[in-house]
């Protein structure tokens, strides 16, 4: 819950649905100066378990556009660059927050809205042995 | 750009900063109701490049807690259940937004913010020899 | 930012040993794996061993393996490099940083370093 103290210079608010319904800045603050996700953008073709990105695309969500990652092989690549069926490829998925325009169209009223997004794959010994 | 056709019944803004400053309202909804996240809730273990996962707190941030994932080892686990320093552990990172409390300690005032959160790992084959 | 203090280093003799240290002054460092790499006057700067702050294994470069030893201590944030039979070649400045990809870290993901300490290794 929120229970901080709260700084006099708070914006007030005179919503009746208050605390509910927040005023939020959409000028994106950037806390990625150290570290460059662009060096992870190989992985999806250099892992064991590797991916294809797909684009999702969404005008009534921001962002907009999200990535989702779709496992290659049901398998994973072993040192000779063949698929071994005794492994999985499977998806990590996180759960993310993003703004839903609400109502619809309406470009300064939006709703918080979880998803789960597929990120990448990892491989992972199996818990149900298909291949004997 | 936020260019789409304005519905009729949206909320008026009078504020100077419009569109940069939008209401949001917190009563998260959940479209994962199809999906079960602790399905891949044993991957961090089972999975070639396994991983920890640390507690991230930050009562100025919603959420306040985000979990990070750290690779276990700079190899990967092979067959043998050994580390083999030929494959290397990576952090598979995303980008998402949080809210950020502005002005601090703040209950209704946020700013969207971009953080970079690591979601598990996956083994890819290296391009730096570091392992003869 | 990420602070990052060496130490231990010096003056000795061919076959001689020095341990140095390395303190993080994070609360907990962004990467999974820390590294030592070390650079020669004139020379590039070149990786030396890496060890992963959870499992604990180490890794180290062909040119210092069985004579190196990567340690690292989790509740002081801290790295150590025990060298043995050090050779006039192992005279460098030398450096820690957090390992943010692990072995897969290349120096062009690096855009701080510390000061490094100096070891001098005399024939």
């Known amino acids: 819950g929120i229970t901080i103290p709260r700084n006099p210079g708070c914006p007030n608010s005179e919503d009746k649905n208050f605390p509910r319904t927040v005023m939020v800045n959409l000028n994106i603050h950037n806390r990625n100066t150290n570290t460059n996700p662009k060096r992870s953008s190989d992985y999806y073709n250099r892992s064991t378990s590797p991916w294809n990105l797909h684009r999702n695309e969404d005008p009534e969500r921001y962002p907009s556009v999200i990535w989702e990652a779709k496992c290659r092989h049901l398998g994973c690549i072993n040192a000779d660059g063949n698929v071994d069926y005794h492994m999985n490829s499977v998806p990590i998925q996180q759960e993310i927050l993003v703004l839903r325009r609400e109502p619809p169209h309406c470009p300064n009223s939006f709703r918080l809205e979880k998803i789960l997004v597929s990120v990448g794959c990892t491989c992972v010994t199996p818990i149900v042995h298909h291949v004997a | 750009g936020i260019t789409i056709p304005r519905n009729p019944g949206c909320p008026n803004s009078e504020d100077k900063n419009f569109p940069r400053t939008v209401m949001v309202n917190l009563n998260i909804h959940n479209r994962n109701t199809n999906t079960n996240p602790k399905r891949s809730s044993d991957y961090y273990n089972r999975s070639t490049s396994p991983w920890n996962l640390h507690r991230n707190e930050d009562p100025e941030r919603y959420p306040s807690v985000i979990w990070e994932a750290k690779c276990r080892h700079l190899g990967c686990i092979n067959a043998d259940g050994n580390v083999d320093y030929h494959m290397n552990s990576v952090p598979i990172q995303q980008e998402i937004l949080v809210l950020r409390r502005e002005p601090p300690h703040c209950p209704n005032s946020f700013r969207l913010e971009k953080i970079l959160v690591s979601v598990g790992c996956t083994c890819v084959t290296p391009i730096v020899h570091h392992v003869a | 930012q990420v602070q990052l203090v060496e130490s231990g280093g010096g003056l000795v003799q061919a076959g001689g040993s020095l341990n140095l240290s390395c303190v993080i002054s994070r609360r907990t460092p962004s990467g999974y794996a820390m590294g030592w790499f070390r650079q020669a006057s004139g020379k590039e700067r070149e990786f030396v061993a890496a060890?992963?702050?959870?499992?604990?294994?180490?890794v180290y470069a062909d040119s210092v393996k069985g004579r190196f030893t990567m340690s690292r201590d989790n509740a002081k944030n801290t790295v150590y490099l025990q060298m043995n039979s050090l050779k006039p070649e192992d005279t460098a400045v030398y450096y820690c940083n957090d390992m943010p990809y692990g072995l897969d870290t290349t120096m062009d993901d690096y855009d701080y370093w510390g000061q490094g300490t100096l070891v001098t290794v005399s024939s």
């Open positions: 060890i992963s702050w959870i499992g604990g294994g180490a």
